[in-house]
Interface confidence: low
């Protein structure tokens, strides 16, 4: 089992273990790393391989989404004998190799995290030269990006029969709870839509019928904080217009 999964760091190769078999290809990545949007995160990845003294050209690769086929977000190459892995690709300039691949470490730093970075990442190493071999983590590491709520849209829209409805859309992780307050409302969760597929961090709450003029406030809250935004409804009586 461990030969596939257990995966170790370089310093383990130097521990005195008398029953240790020859090293095999394996990769050690944690199941998940959590960090807040705007911060940086480190995705650890260490590996072992059967080519004990490999000193030839190597390429380190990180991809997102799925193993083997997902888009590359980072790639660097080291020449024979070199410990410097020269970056050939760093998506949006936000990915930087922290580890030393010659020391069996492919750990990656991701800067300026956004909620869109919340996905699974897979590390891969390729040996060229006299040894042709490669290995990629199958399970990868899930980067879990958390974020305080942010209201991305709040609006009043006309409804049938001269009524108005209010929509509030917020993003955050964990997905925020939304509540409306306003004239004759008290505190209402209104109709909260489930996060839409592909937009897992977005939540929308609708007030289907605004019956009174005045200020309507949407509050988004999760364990990391809260955010508020307001709209104003002033109907021109006798007409079907509104000022917001």
């Amino acid at each position: 089992f461990v030969r596939t999964k257990i995966d170790t760091t370089e310093n383990l190769l130097n521990t005195e273990v008398h029953s240790s078999p020859a090293q095999r290809w394996s990769m050690q990545v944690p199941p998940e790393v959590s960090a807040e949007a705007g911060d940086a995160a480190v995705l650890p990845c260490t590996f072992t391989h059967p080519h004990r003294h490999y000193d030839g050209p190597l390429t380190a690769i990180w991809r997102a989404g799925e193993p083997y086929a997902g888009p590359q977000v980072f790639r660097c190459a080291a020449a024979r004998g070199s410990e410097l892995c020269q970056t050939a690709l760093s998506l949006h300039g936000r990915f930087r190799l922290l580890g030393n691949p010659r020391r069996n470490d492919l750990s990656l730093r991701v800067e300026r995290l956004a909620l869109a970075d919340d996905r699974r990442y897979f590390c891969r190493v390729e040996f060229a030269g006299d040894v042709h071999d490669r290995y990629e983590s199958r399970h990868g590491v899930r980067l879990h990006v958390t974020a305080a709520p942010r209201i991305v849209n709040i609006s009043v829209l006309p409804s049938p029969a001269h009524a108005f409805r209010a929509l509030c859309t917020a993003e955050g992780e964990p997905p925020p709870a939304l509540a409306w307050s306003g004239p004759a409302l008290g505190n209402s969760l209104a109709a909260v839509r489930s996060p839409r597929e592909g937009h897992g961090h977005l939540v929308t709450a609708e007030l289907p019928a605004l019956t009174h003029d005045g200020r309507y406030t949407c509050t988004a809250a999760n364990s990391l904080g809260r955010s508020e935004a307001s709209v104003y409804l002033f109907r021109f009586h006798g007409a079907s217009g509104a000022s917001t």
Epitope: V2, P30, P31, R134, Y135, E136
Partner: antibody, heavy 114, light 113 residues
Framework: QVQLKQSGAELVRPGASVKLSCKAS????????INWVKQRPGQGLEWIAR????????DYNEKFKDKATLTAEKSSTTAYIQLSSLTSEDSAVYFC???????WGTGTTVTVSS | DIVMTQSPSSLTVTAGEKVTMSCKSS????????????LTWYQQKPGQPPKLLIY???TRESGVPDRFTGSGSGTDFTLTISNVQPEDLAVYYC?????????FGSGTELEMK
């Protein structure tokens, strides 16, 4: 020399819980997964779960998710498996093992009986 | 879960014979990342924990006699013991080392005539 020393046999009542230990020595405890495997008398092997003591990360076989809880104590280099709501189906030998070095404990026999 | 099916369930042999046992997996165990088959063979003698014999379907663990040979790819695998010795009497398990949960076959028991 890499070794795993398991706690002694347990006789427990149905519905009770039991916590088995696996003391590791001879290697860097935090750096290698410890796996737990179940073997009922005269039967085959079943992988229960594994734990990475360095950070406590665990991977479970879904079948055992509500039955077994894995923990590891770095200070004593000991891994534990707690088995809950025991029934006769849980009567078995439980092995801890380090696949990386192909080192196994000798196994702990758990007998569930009233 | 990947289901591992071993056959036969038992084999009766004479010392010096050559024996083969089969292991089939319900899904391919070939890792396209490194072209290795993640199939492991274990030997278990009565009252003992299992012992690793073969990993990556065909790579013999250090210290394992060369009369043990693993072969196969994808979903069909074979363990061959040439020139069986009395100390080889044991149950042999194949195991999916490819994906969670790691699963074992039900075993093939080797008995002596």
């Amino acid at each position: 020399q890499v070794q795993l020393k398991q706690s002694g046999a347990e006789l427990v009542r149905p519905g009770a819980s039991v916590k088995l230990s696996c003391k590791a020595s001879g290697y860097t405890f935090t750096d290698y997964y410890i796996n737990w495997v179940k073997q009922r008398p005269g039967q085959g092997l079943e992988w229960i779960a594994r734990i990475y003591p360095g950070n406590g990360n665990t991977d479970y076989n879904e079948k055992f998710k509500d039955k077994a809880t894995l923990t590891a104590e770095k200070s004593s280099t000991t891994a534990y498996i707690q088995l809950s709501s025991l029934t006769s189906e849980d009567s078995a030998v439980y092995f801890c093992c380090l696949w990386y070095f192909d080192v196994w404990g000798t196994g702990t026999t758990v007998t569930v009986s009233s | 879960d990947i289901v591992m099916t071993q056959s036969p369930s038992s084999l009766t042999v004479t010392a010096g014979e050559k024996v083969t046992m089969s292991c089939k997996s319900s899904q391919s165990l070939l890792n396209s990342g490194n072209q290795k088959n993640y199939l492991t063979w274990y030997q278990q003698k009565p009252g003992q924990p299992p012992k690793l014999l073969i990993y990556w379907a065909s790579t013999r663990e250090s210290g394992v006699p060369d009369r043990f040979t693993g072969s196969g790819s994808g979903t069909d695998f074979t363990l061959t013991i040439s020139n069986v010795q009395p100390e080889d009497l044991a149950v042999y398990y194949c195991q999916n080392d490819y994906s969670f949960p790691f699963t074992f076959g039900s075993g093939t028991e080797l008995e002596m005539k």
